[in-house]
């Protein structure tokens, strides 16, 4: 029961986490700039991984995708890659974990197979969460290092001057969504790995057992001792015999024709 609950909770937490990672990746507010009060209008600028937007004091908002890969910080490409890898791994993990759920019965799937699938999905969630946390952290670090512009960086361009507009950076909402979502996915993955331990059949090392039939009518049935999972009603794993079974330590040795005096 505890394993099913842990597995189910891990799945739900990971599901929420991955939904959050997807949301963060799509959000426009990764970084927000309160631009200097433009003489024409107060301008509020914010950027995402895929496009940047401007909101004027009038309320007018416009967003445009980045014109070209050139002129984009290399780190932005790395963040995009990390977030996409996180989403892909998380999505595969979700797919695998659905089939691994103990409460869902698919054909005659062994507990060991479900345990393996649970572990696989758990590892995928952990890596997915780490990718998201890493991506968001790299972006945050990029903001801290690149956006401290005490003076506008001026250089000569064709036909005049071009300068980077002086800004005061702030972390956008997407960063916080990403950090929380990555954390949840990570926690969900850990829970799945913990659940896997409970699902896995116990490798019990039984002593070798020799059977002595007390009567001619008693036949030995193979597979009498199977390892128990330790969960649920163990109907199949009952001893075949109550009597007649002794460990090798208890077996009495009887004289035979090969015994020498």
């Amino acid at each position: 029961m505890a394993v099913t609950a842990c597995q189910g909770l891990g799945f739900v937490v990971s599901l929420i986490g991955i939904a959050g990672i997807i949301a963060a990746t799509c959000m426009d507010q990764w970084s927000t700039q309160d631009l200097y009060n433009n003489p024409v209008t107060a301008v509020f600028n914010y950027q995402g991984l895929w496009r940047s937007c401007v909101r004027e004091s009038s309320g007018f908002t416009e967003c445009r995708g980045y014109f070209t890969l050139l002129g984009l910080p290399a780190m932005l490409q790395a963040v995009r890659a990390l977030m996409i890898v996180g989403i892909v791994l998380g999505a595969i993990g979700l797919l695998v974990s659905i089939f691994a759920l103990k409460c869902i019965r698919i054909g005659s799937m062994e507990d060991s197979a479900k345990a393996n699938m649970t572990l696989t999905s758990g590892i995928m969630f952990i890596v997915s969460g780490l990718c998201a946390i890493a991506g968001v952290s790299v972006f945050a670090n990029m903001l801290v290092t690149n956006f401290w512009m005490s003076t506008a960086n001026m250089y000569t361009g064709m036909g005049g001057m071009v300068q980077t507009v002086q800004t005061r950076y702030t972390f956008g909402a997407a960063l916080f969504v990403g950090w929380v979502a990555g954390g949840l996915t990570l926690i969900g993955g850990v829970m799945m790995c913990i659940a896997c331990r409970g699902l896995a059949p116990e490798e019990t090392n039984y002593k070798a057992v020799s059977y002595h039939a007390s009567g001619h009518s008693v036949a030995y049935k193979p597979g009498g001792f199977k390892a128990s999972t330790g969960f649920g009603s163990n109907t199949k794993n009952k001893k075949i015999y109550d009597g007649g079974a002794r460990t090798e330590d208890e077996v009495q040795s009887y004289p035979s024709k090969h015994d020498y005096v």
């Epitope: 024409v40 209008t41 004027e56 445009r64 014109f67 005049g160």
Partner: nanobody, 120 residues
Framework: QVQLVESGGGLVQPGGSLRLSCAAS????????MAWYRQAPGKQREFVSG???????NYADSVKGRFTISRDFAKNTVDLQMNSLKPEDTAVYYC??????????????WGQGTLVTVSS
């Protein structure tokens, strides 16, 4: 490469009119903010007039009622119609385009400037 080229400057008598034009290449004329600035000899560059993609228009107090800013999407230009010119309007007029969308780092582009001299 973004290029802003101003034209239309020259010598004009006080009370006269002049139309400045800023041709933008490599940039959408509906850039987030398009503006005109001027710099008189020995003075700092000051804002004259500007418009935004959202339609907000603003003028410096010293030119209100005399100057009109407009944009021509067909020609990809931003124009500044200057009427009732005064000697204190003498300056080098610069076209400015500020781009916040479509670029990760907000950028400000400047033209080379065109000289306007108001003198009798």
């Amino acid at each position: 490469q973004v290029q802003l080229v101003e034209s239309g400057g020259g010598l004009v008598q006080p009370g006269g009119s002049l139309r400045l034009s800023c041709a933008a290449s490599g940039v959408d004329i509906s850039s987030d903010v398009m503006a005109w600035y001027r710099q008189a000899p020995g003075k700092q560059r000051e804002f004259v007039s500007g418009l935004t993609r959202g339609g907000s228009i603003n003028y410096a107090d010293s030119v209100k009622g005399r100057f009109t800013i407009s944009r021509d999407f067909a020609k990809n230009t931003v124009d500044l119609q200057m009427n009732s010119l005064k000697p204190e309007d003498t300056a080098v007029y610069y076209c400015n385009a500020e781009i916040y969308t479509g670029t990760f780092y907000p950028r400000s582009y400047w033209g080379q400037g065109t000289l306007v001299t108001v003198s009798s």
